[in-house]
Interface confidence: medium
């Protein structure tokens, strides 16, 4: 069937359209195109005779039409009037006619739209705004965009006038956005430039910052006011109802108690004509005094007095804090805090309680800290020490003794020789001493504040002959592989050489042997049982020499792994079993036996008469050294056979 296809169907003004013929019959004489839905000679556009290939324009020909041999018709530079139906009339060679009708629609190319508004500065919660998309165009569809998104669903948004008008009822500040409109028809779509809706709003109730309302005298008051508003608000400050200044910030340096009062910020929007105010009450407090510590006893005596330290001044609703030596208070039964923490009591002070002590106060107005306080604890004197420690001197040398005792206030010193007062000095000096200077030298230390005195007595021997030395030991019973022993040769004498012998021989070279203190001290590290020998020390100077009595080192060791004898493990029934256990140990160990795990007797020898196969089993000897705290054991299996069943069996003891 003959058909006409319009390509395209919707045509933009100025463009072209092709009326394409399908199923054109064979053996044609010619054809003709007409404007409209029927053949009408007055509305013929063009005719075409195939035989002559001659095209003849008709009354409706506009000069923009081109006919093709396949009967298709091209129309160029389309105008709005070209919209409608077109009819093709085909004349076949047998003079039978055939007709087909096609159509297309013409649309204008849309211009870029623009948005007009009935209110350029709407007021929030009061005004409505109507946006209209210009120009008005026939057969166009209108669309709206907010912030490049399609319109949200809202009862305050209404489309009218074929969607050409967008109305926002009761605008809010949130309607401040970018608005665009778009026009569409079948041949084009155009979007407008954006229009920003400028909603006038506010001022809201202003906020005053910072929020704190309590200040100390001498501080700076700096208040800032802000209210949401469009256009931005104009600000005014009032103090106790009196206008101050038209600024957003209010600054008052170095405030006093007189600056206390109500501070009002007024925000004004000149476009909406609205005013809003906020009031804050500022309280200025006098600067609290810096805290300080008072003490009930400025010179407490060690181990006698208690001291109460109080943080001044007393202030209500205040937290009191304490520091000792810049640390929080240690937990101690000698430290007590009052219920309000204001008083710190030191029970029975010691010399270590000097401090420094600090207190702090904390409340909603201030945080403050005292200066440190140091306690003057009176103590001592402790037992004085006399130096040097020599007790033997040769005639002709100078004797110079110094005395020291820990004390606060520092001790006053006195020297006595054989009970007779010599001088009130810390040092005693006697030149060119003789044997007559031998005697008891006493240092007396006196604390004038506490009234306490302590003495130390030292025996000084002045002799050309050296005394017989003796050996002192720091450990009379060292444990093998564990302890060290330090032998010291007494006395300490000036200009003296110290020598050592072990079992009558000079000291062997050993990393475990060390001489120190001018060879006066011999240290044995990690003693062994082989160190249990005779030790002798000797002293000598240019005129004499002497040796000590020997000291034998008693090294505690063991018990070593015990040995059970005899070594036999097989016995004949009826024999006597006599087992002896031995372990090297100092002191001798305690022995005990177990047979098959069952405790027996606490003896070194285990004797069982006339054994039977029932005596088969494990025989364990346990050894224990109470001095070293060490234990050891050994286990032996004993087999008892019936008489005569097995050769080579022991007959027993």
């Amino acid at each position: 069937k003959l058909t006409i296809e319009s390509t395209p169907f919707n045509v933009a003004e100025g463009k072209e359209v092709l009326l394409l013929v399908h199923n054109l019959p064979q053996h044609l004489f010619g054809y003709s195109w007409y404007k409209g839905e029927r053949v009408d000679g007055n509305r013929q556009i063009i005719g075409y005779v195939i035989g002559t290939q001659q095209a003849t324009p008709g009354p409706a020909y506009s000069g923009r039409e081109i006919i093709y041999p396949n009967a298709s018709l091209l129309i160029q530079n389309i105008i709005q009037n070209d919209t409608g139906f077109y009819t093709l009339h085909v004349i076949k060679s047998d003079l039978v006619n055939e007709e087909a009708t096609g159509q297309f629609r013409v649309y204008p190319e849309l211009p870029k739209p623009s948005i007009s508004s009935n209110n350029s500065k709407p007021v929030e919660d009061k005004d409505a705004v109507a946006f209209t998309c210009e120009p008005e165009t026939q057969d166009a569809t209108y669309l709206w965009w907010v912030n490049n998104q399609s319109l949200p669903v809202s009862p305050r948004l209404q489309l009218s006038n074929g969607n050409r008008t967008l109305t926002l009822f009761n605008v809010t500040r949130n309607d401040t956005a970018s608005y665009k409109c778009e026009t569409q028809n079948p041949v084009s779509a155009r979007r407008s430039d954006s229009v920003i809706l400028n909603v006038l709003y506010g001022p809201d109730a202003p906020t005053i910052s910072p929020l704190n309302t309590s200040y100390r005298s001498g501080e700076n008051l700096n208040l800032s006011c802000h209210a949401a508003s469009n256009p931005p608000a104009q600000y005014s400050w009032f103090v106790n109802g009196t206008f101050q200044q038209s600024t957003q910030e209010l600054f008052i340096p170095n405030i006093t108690v007189n600056n206390s009062g109500s501070y009002t910020c007024q925000a004004h929007n000149s476009d909406t004509g609205l005013n809003r105010t906020t009031v804050t009450t500022i309280t200025v407090y006098a600067e609290p005094p810096k805290p300080f510590i008072t003490s009930n006893n400025s010179n407490p005596v060690e181990d006698e007095d208690a001291v109460a330290l109080t943080c001044e001044p007393e202030i209500q609703n205040t937290t009191y804090l304490w520091w000792v030596n810049n640390q929080s208070l240690p937990v101690s039964p000698r430290l007590q805090l009052s219920n309000d923490n204001r008083t710190l009591t030191l029970l029975s002070v010691t010399r270590n309680d000097v401090g420094p002590y600090e207190c702090g106060i904390q409340n909603e107005l201030s945080v403050d800290h005292s200066d440190p306080v140091i306690l003057n604890v009176l103590y001592g004197p402790d037992d004085p020490t006399i130096s040097p420690s020599y007790t033997y001197y040769r005639p002709g040398v100078n004797l110079s003794l110094s005395c020291h005792a820990a004390s606060n206030p520092p001790a006053q010193y006195s020297w006595l020789i054989d009970g007779n007062i010599q001088q009130h000095t810390q040092e005693l000096f006697i030149s060119n001493i003789t044997e007559k200077n031998s005697g008891l030298y006493t240092c007396q230390a006196n604390n004038s504040a506490s009234g306490h005195s302590r003495t130390t007595v030292k025996t000084i021997t002045v002799s050309a002959e050296l005394p017989k030395p003796s050996i002192s030991s720091n450990n009379s019973k060292p444990v093998e592989d564990k302890d060290a022993v330090a032998f010291t040769c007494e006395p300490e004498a000036q200009n003296t050489t110290y020598l050592w012998w072990v079992n009558g021989q000079s000291l062997p070279v050993s990393p475990r042997l060390q001489l120190s203190n001018g060879n006066r001290t011999l240290t044995l590290f990690n003693v062994t049982r082989n160190d249990a020998r005779a030790y002798v020390c000797g002293i000598q100077n240019s005129v004499s020499a002497n040796r000590s009595d020997p000291v034998t080192l008693d090294v505690l060791y063991g018990p070593d792994t015990p040995i059970i004898s005899p070594p036999d493990s097989s016995y004949l029934s009826g024999a006597n079993l006599n087992l002896s256990c031995h372990s090297a140990s100092n002191p001798s160990p305690q022995y005990s036996w177990r047979i098959n795990g069952i405790p027996q007797q606490h003896t070194q020898v285990l004797f069982i008469a006339k054994i039977t196969p029932n005596n088969n089993g494990t025989y364990a000897c346990f050894v224990s050294n109470l001095a070293t705290g060490r234990n050891n054991s050994i286990v032996k299996s004993i087999t008892v056979s019936a008489s005569g069943t097995s050769p080579g069996l022991s007959a027993g003891a």
Partner: antibody
């Protein structure tokens, strides 16, 4: 104008010694406790030592205890830090700082610092 | 020793913005906390002490808050001169420890 000026920094061998000084001006030096604070390269701040107005109260950080000694000369308005047995980790800018008047343990005035580099 | 944890370690912001730096302590220090600002190559400068008291000459756009173990430093309407590193420090008891610092950079 309150001012603290440190001096004495420089390159020191590991195990070596150095003394830093801090000259104070513009305030009554003898009325303020003084601190040393240091800052290692690309690192944070570390308190080192404190000395009270009468030199009777002295505190040290554990990292320097036994090696550093803080002292002061009130008539000469000068603070000192004697550093011994120096280690590579002591490399830092050393700041002299003032303790606040109201006895708080913060640092209300700082010097510009002096750099100590411990390296072989 | 009291431990100081400062966050964030670094922060980018633009002029005019508001930023908050926080400092957490391992035990109660009441209000004994200070804040310092340090610019590149310069010594630190005291901003706030006793958690919220502004040091002399510090602009009011700086504010400190908090007590106990949680503290913060707020800067409103950042200015070009506010960029640098900020440190918190407790001034409760020795040793006086500093936080690790927050580097405030311009975006």
């Amino acid at each position: 104008d309150v001012q603290l000026v440190e001096s004495g920094g420089g390159l020191v061998q590991p195990g070596g010694s150095r003394e830093l000084s801090c000259a104070a001006s513009g305030f009554t030096f003898s009325s303020f406790g003084m601190h040393w604070v240091r800052q290692a390269p690309e690192r944070g701040l570390e308190w080192v030592a404190y000395i009270s107005i009468g030199s009777d109260i002295i505190y040290y950080a554990d990292t320097v205890k036994g090696r550093f000694t803080i002292s002061r000369d009130n008539p000469k308005n000068t603070l000192f830090l004697q550093m011994t047995s120096l280690r590579s980790e002591d490399t830092a800018v050393y700041y002299c700082t003032r303790r606040s008047y109201r006895s708080y343990w913060y640092f209300d005035v700082w010097g510009a610092g002096t750099t100590v580099t411990v390296s072989s | 020793d009291i431990q100081m944890t400062q966050s964030p370690a670094s922060l980018s912001a633009s002029v005019g913005e508001t930023v908050t730096i926080t400092c957490r302590t391992s035990e109660n220090i009441y209000s004994y906390l200070a804040w310092y600002q340090q610019k590149q190559g310069k010594s630190p400068h005291l901003l706030v002490y006793n958690a919220k008291t502004l040091a002399e000459g510090v602009p009011s756009r700086f504010s400190g808050s908090g007590s106990g173990t949680q503290f913060s430093l707020k800067i409103i309407s950042l200015q070009p001169e506010d960029f640098g590193t900020y440190y918190c420090q407790h001034h409760f008891l020795s040793p006086w420890m500093f936080g690790g610092g927050t580097k405030l950079e311009i975006k």
